[in-house]
């Protein structure tokens, strides 16, 4: 069961896996959740009754029964990992810890104007896990405003001590706030010859890359495939680092693959969720249980539902044995990866899907698209919403996109003349406008947040957020779209679609069925030539065919320009403005979402 509350003055007895240092019990719970085996923890807060060397210790624990005996102890705070919970989990920690020195390996010392600047520096430095900043009130004059960037093997401090007039905090890479490049390519026949910080077994290079991404010290990796000549190294995933942050040497070697940590794009790409099945593959590890199961899918479900299960191997039933049920071996290991991978034994293996909730919901694969045609089908664009106004009568006003369970991203120009959020209704999971009746459920709008630099669509900043009154429960027909990574600014998107219920030509009416059109992106230089009377800024993005014919139009405003990249859909643009609709040499102009990621995160993650 999911227990989220913390138990004050309580200590769990036994079951220790390891001890780390965390600045708070809340963060200890997050560390426990991300640890492959931790189910419970005990944190020691600072207290006069406690030995200062034990302050801020976070003891990670495991138990076969999923619980441990409780003992009363002043200053101890205990709790359970969120592994047992179904809600979305994030490692993002924006808290600033006052008067705490989080110790680690200081590898960079420089002057910064503020703690925020120091944190930004940490976020944009490939090695940085956390920082300590000496404030203007720090007793040592010479050390005031010094920003120390730190890292450790575990990503958590090696010790935490009290220190007046300093503040500490963590890198915001896991909050999607890093400007570091996001390199998704996997390089075949390549070995990166740098120092290994760890090695695990993985079934393929993609899993290896995902493991590298959530390993605190891994910056890039090399994976030896099952055809690798040296048998003892087959399926070996080497996690690597270097001082520069980049591989120093690339060696051409057949049957090896290499790539980079996806740390700076992890909010828009799955990094915890290994959903594939590996046929004719056996995963070895500590056996948790052996259960009968009808299929490998059923076996994966059993593993996902068993909180301690990390991976499984399913052996299909022999002919008519056991009512056609095979054996499902539920397994675990110290690091969450198989201890050995064997091929050719007929097993089907895979991983728990329990960790999928640590990934952004927007990375979930949606059902295959219908190729051709202009009318969409149900569930094809599950992030698309229709925004209605009820004044003076109810009608479709604009499109919008679900980007979080309480947030819709749309265009600012939609709210011209809208006096209050009370007159707005957001409908999700809608294909046809005719589905919307008096009793159709909708989301009320709690708040309209318009970019404070917005004046008119043509001059930019045409972006707005709607905070919903209630949260969206994600289903196949209503789920979020990923925001583009700031590290993806140089990605060239080739599979982009504009969707909406808007006009199909300039003098027309709102369409009943959600329309879609595949549209190529146009460079800003090209776009500027087509709009000589306007300034096409880097905060705008253009799309359209030279000959015209396909475009967004009236009523599509605020809706998404969705681009698929590496199997994940990204909200690249917001339909904003254009000259006419689908006119020759007049591309549509969209708000360039990547340039507003900081603004979006600032508004949506505000406490």
């Amino acid at each position: 069961e999911c227990v989220t509350q913390l138990l004050k003055d309580t200590c769990f007895e036994g079951g220790d896996i390891t001890t780390v240092f965390t600045p708070s019990a809340k963060y200890c719970q997050v560390v426990c959740t991300y640890h492959p085996r931790c189910l419970l923890f005990t944190f020691t807060a600072e207290s006069p009754s406690e030995d200062p060397t034990r302050w801020f210790t976070c003891v990670l624990k495991d138990s076969v029964t999923e619980t441990l005996p409780r003992v009363n102890r002043t200053a101890a705070i205990s709790g359970y990992s969120f592994k047992q919970c179904s809600h979305q989990i994030s490692a993002c920690n924006k808290d600033i810890y006052v008067d705490l020195d989080m110790k680690g390996i200081n590898y960079n010392s420089s002057v910064a104007k503020s703690a925020q600047e120091c944190q930004e520096r940490c976020t944009d430095d490939v090695h940085c896990h956390f920082f300590t900043y000496a404030t203007r009130q720090f007793p040592s004059l010479e050390h005031r405003n010094i920003c120390l960037l730190k890292h450790t093997q575990t990503g958590t401090p090696t010790r935490i001590t009290k220190l007046d007039k300093v503040v500490s905090g963590f890198s915001l890479k896991s909050c999607a706030l890093s400007n570091l490049a996001c390199i998704r390519d996997i390089f075949p026949n390549t070995v990166f010859a740098d120092s290994n910080i760890d090695s695990v077994m993985a079934p393929d290079a993609f899993v290896c890359g995902r493991i590298c991404t959530h390993h605190p010290g891994c910056l890039f990796f090399t994976f030896f495939s099952q055809e690798w000549p040296k048998e003892s190294q087959r399926n070996l995933c080497l996690l690597k680092t270097s001082e520069s942050g980049l591989p120093s040497t690339r060696i051409k070697k057949s049957k090896a693959l290499s790539g980079f940590s996806l740390q700076s794009c992890r909010h828009s790409i799955p990094v915890f969720c290994h959903s594939s099945f590996y046929h004719d593959t056996d995963f070895l590890g500590e056996e948790l249980d052996i259960v009968a199961a009808k299929s490998h899918e059923a076996c994966q479900k059993l593993c996902t539902n068993a909180v301690r299960c990390q991976f499984f191997t399913y052996t299909p039933a022999q002919a008519s044995c056991n009512e056609g049920k095979g054996k499902c071996y539920l397994k675990l290991s110290s690091n969450g990866s198989p201890t050995k991978i064997l091929h050719g034994r007929g097993g089907i293996s895979g991983y728990t899907l329990r960790l999928c909730k640590m990934d952004n919901e927007c990375t979930t694969k949606i059902k295959p698209r219908i190729v051709g045609g202009t009318a969409s089908v149900r569930g094809e664009w599950p992030w698309q919403v229709t925004l209605h106004t009820t004044s003076p009568t109810q009608r479709h006003l604009c499109g919008g996109s679900i980007i979080g369970n309480q947030w819709i991203l749309t265009a600012a120009h939609c709210f011209y003349g809208v006096e209050s959020p009370k007159i707005l209704r957001v409908y999700s999971g809608i294909l046809n406008q005719s589905e919307i009746k008096e009793d159709t459920s909708f989301f009320g709008v709690q708040e309209i947040i318009i970019h404070d630099q917005y004046k008119m669509a043509e001059s930019g900043y045409d972006i707005a957020l709607l905070k919903l009154e209630t949260t969206v429960n994600y289903t196949d027909s209503q789920r979020p779209i990923c925001l583009p990574s700031k590290g993806d600014r140089n990605v060239i998107y080739t599979d982009c679609w504009v969707t909406g219920w808007g006009y199909r030509k300039l003098r027309d009416k709102i369409q009943n069925t959600l329309q879609k059109a595949k549209i190529p992106l146009v460079t800003n230089e090209e776009c500027q030539k087509r709009y000589r009377g306007h300034k096409i800024t880097h905060k705008m993005i253009c799309a359209g065919y030279r000959e015209g014919g396909k475009d967004a139009c009236k009523g599509d405003s605020g809706g998404p320009l969705s681009c698929k990249h590496n199997e994940v859909w990204h909200l690249v643009g917001i339909t904003s403005w254009g000259e006419g609709c689908a006119q020759r040499e007049r591309p549509g102009v969209y708000t360039n979402v990547v340039e507003y990621v900081d603004w979006i995160l600032e508004k949506t993650q505000a406490v």
Partner: antibody, heavy 116, light 107 residues
Framework: QVQLQESGPGLVKPSETLSITCTVS????????IYWVRQPPGKGLEWLGM???????DYNSALKSRVTISKDNSKSQVSLKLSSVTAADTARYYC??????????WGQGTTVTVSS | DIQMTQSPSSLSASVGDRVTITCKAS??????VAWYQQKPGKAPKLLIY???YRNTGVPDRFSGSGSGTDFTFTISSLQPEDIAVYYC?????????FGGGTKVEIK
């Protein structure tokens, strides 16, 4: 683990330049300041100067014209040069790591005698 | 430059006694004062930094207090292994400077 090790010439002639190197391990010079401190035989500690993580330097006012501290981050080495030495510069020379102005780790020191 | 005047220059006390050493700065140094212990033939060892923070592994019989210009270092119960020279140091403003030292002996 954190270690600092001084290495010096042992004996230096008057008016020459004294050069000592401090080689560190277990931490990076880009993240920590390094101090030089000396102790004449039977006397107290004297602060000579420091080099910060970002390369800035600070020196003892009385020795400023004669002291130079530099470093090579890639080699994890900090060097102290003291020019125009006299017998008064005979001392044990220590390098130490900065922790907010205090010195949390010290080398074992190297003895330098100035004599002709 | 800031001068640190340490007193006494030497003291003799019995095992278990409370020992106090003082340090006076020539100008305000906030709370940026450290205390070191040096045993014969060894490098100094950091005991206290920023007036009152004990370094890792330092026994709690060692403590420090003060602010501005007047600082005190205390050994609450002198032990035989505490025989050493103790130095204060201001780390408020460069050039940093040490006190002249206090030699602690057992009676």
């Amino acid at each position: 683990q954190v270690q600092l090790q001084e290495s010096g010439p042992g004996l230096v002639k008057p008016s020459e330049t004294l050069s000592i190197t401090c080689t560190v391990s277990g931490f990076s010079l880009t993240g920590y300041g390094i101090y030089w401190v000396r102790q004449p035989p039977g006397k107290g500690l004297e602060w000579l100067g420091m080099i910060w993580g970002d390369g800035r330097t600070d020196y003892n006012s009385a020795l400023k014209s004669r002291v130079t501290i530099s470093k090579d981050n890639s080699k994890s080495q900090v060097s102290l040069k003291l020019s125009s030495v006299t017998a008064a510069d005979t001392a044990r020379y220590y390098c130490a790591r900065d922790y907010y102005g205090s010195k949390d780790y010290w080398g074992q020191g190297t003895t330098v005698t100035v004599s002709s | 430059d800031i001068q640190m005047t340490q007193s006494p220059s030497s003291l003799s006390a019995s095992v278990g006694d409370r020992v106090t050493i003082t340090c006076k700065a020539s100008q305000d140094v906030s709370t940026a004062v450290a205390w070191y212990q040096q045993k014969p033939g060894k490098a100094p060892k950091l005991l206290i930094y920023l007036t009152s923070y004990r370094n890792t592994g330092v026994p709690d019989r060692f403590s420090g207090s003060g602010s501005g210009t007047d600082f005190t270092f205390t050994i609450s119960s002198l032990q035989p292994e505490d025989i050493a020279v103790y130095y204060c140091q201001q780390h408020y403003k460069t050039p940093y400077s040490f006190g002249g030292g206090t030699k602690v002996e057992i009676k």
